[in-house]
Amino acid sequence: PLATIPVSTTSLTSSEGSTISTPSVDISTPVTTSIVGDQCSRCKNGGFWDGLKCQCLTPYYGESCEEVVNSIDIAPPETVSAQMELTVTVTSVKFTDELKNHSSQEFREFNKTFTEQMNIVYSGIPEYVGVNITNLRLGSVVVEHDVLLRTKYTPEYKTALDNATEVVKQKITKVTTEQIMTNDNCSALMCFNTTGTQVQNITVTQYDPVEECRQKAEEYEDYFLVEYRDQKPYCISPCESGFNASKNCNHGKCQMSQNGARCLCVTTETHWYSGEDCNQGTQKSHHHHHH
């Protein structure tokens, strides 16, 4: 939200030098008027009258939806995930037709043992969530399954998930190489055919805060940018204070136009201010400049 500037007069001067009489300035080109019943309200920029006030669309606000917000809410997901489609061949269980039926006792027991085995294999991976068998087929038992990974959203989430998928590949390759049958017997929880291990596909959550910011900023997309604070992305215009990209309007008010952020300089009883950043003050009585 914009901070109000205590001034003794209501006039604002744009940094180009023209005096503007009202603080709420219509700086947007697209104007639509919403009329409901007898109530005529100038709800601009796609806003609509709800019977009491204008309901504005992002990124607009104000009585008539004529002003542009300084920041837009973007909500990255709490967590991001990856799904790896893998195939392994289990040799310590012989295939039977009942394994194709996911509600059979055979499938349930196989699923229990397989899940226990995979939980052991991936126990050192913090992103590991679990496995989900998608299909069982002959040979001894070819297990098509998904390995599910999840991590908290951070700007580096893709790297974290990419690293985790690499560790999954290493661990499944290791276990299916080491846990093999000897004389048709398996001494491990499960034994595997080393050559049957394949990674079919990897899908990683796609989330781009910059893209979401640009989409929500609509025609102001070139002037809104993403900055991070405590690993959380903020979609801001230069008029939002407290960020690296914040515009300092000194003795003025920052306002967005379709040409970007500009400063509207204040005029007080003693001074008028000018300059791109409203940092040039002129004393009214003495006409003396000070910086």
């Epitope: 040799t91 310590s92 269980v93 012989k94 039977t96 009942e98 006792q105 055979e106 027991e109 196989f110 229990k112 043992t113 226990e116 049958m181 048709d184 017997n185 398996c186 001494s187 491990a188 929880l189 499960m190 034994c191």
Partner: nanobody, 123 residues
């Protein structure tokens, strides 16, 4: 839910014989796997004799030629005939079963267990 109940354990002199039985209520497991495991004092549970519905059998090296596993599907019962018993055969013997056709000696892969029957070989 499948229940397995062992019987036939007891005290026997070295060189003697015992026949353990395991009666199953519920599923017959004629299509799966059956097995006998034992746990000696202070040791982990180990596979003694295992059998699967496709004809696979396993015997621990220490019991080969002395123990025989068999099953009677009509009675829903698994047997372990133990001959030439030794002091080192003293253990709690457990019956185990699975609907899966297994090839594994690892007890964690077996989902159904009896309460066990004690076998003590002592002079």
């Amino acid at each position: 839910e499948v229940q397995l109940v062992e019987s036939g354990g007891g005290v026997v002199q070295p060189g003697g014989s015992l026949r353990l039985s395991c009666a199953a209520s519920g599923d017959t497991f004629s299509r799966g796997s059956w097995g006998w495991f034992r746990q000696r004092p202070g040791k982990e549970r180990e596979a003694v004799a295992l059998i699967s519905s496709d004809g696979w059998t396993f015997y621990a090296d220490s019991v080969k030629g002395r123990f025989t596993i068999s099953q009677d599907n009509s009675k829903n019962t698994l047997y372990l005939q133990m001959n030439s018993l030794r002091a080192e055969d003293t253990a709690m013997y457990y019956c185990a079963a699975s609907v899966l056709v297994l090839r594994t000696l690892n007890p964690k892969a077996w989902h159904h267990w009896g309460q066990g029957t004690q076998v003590t070989v002592s002079s």
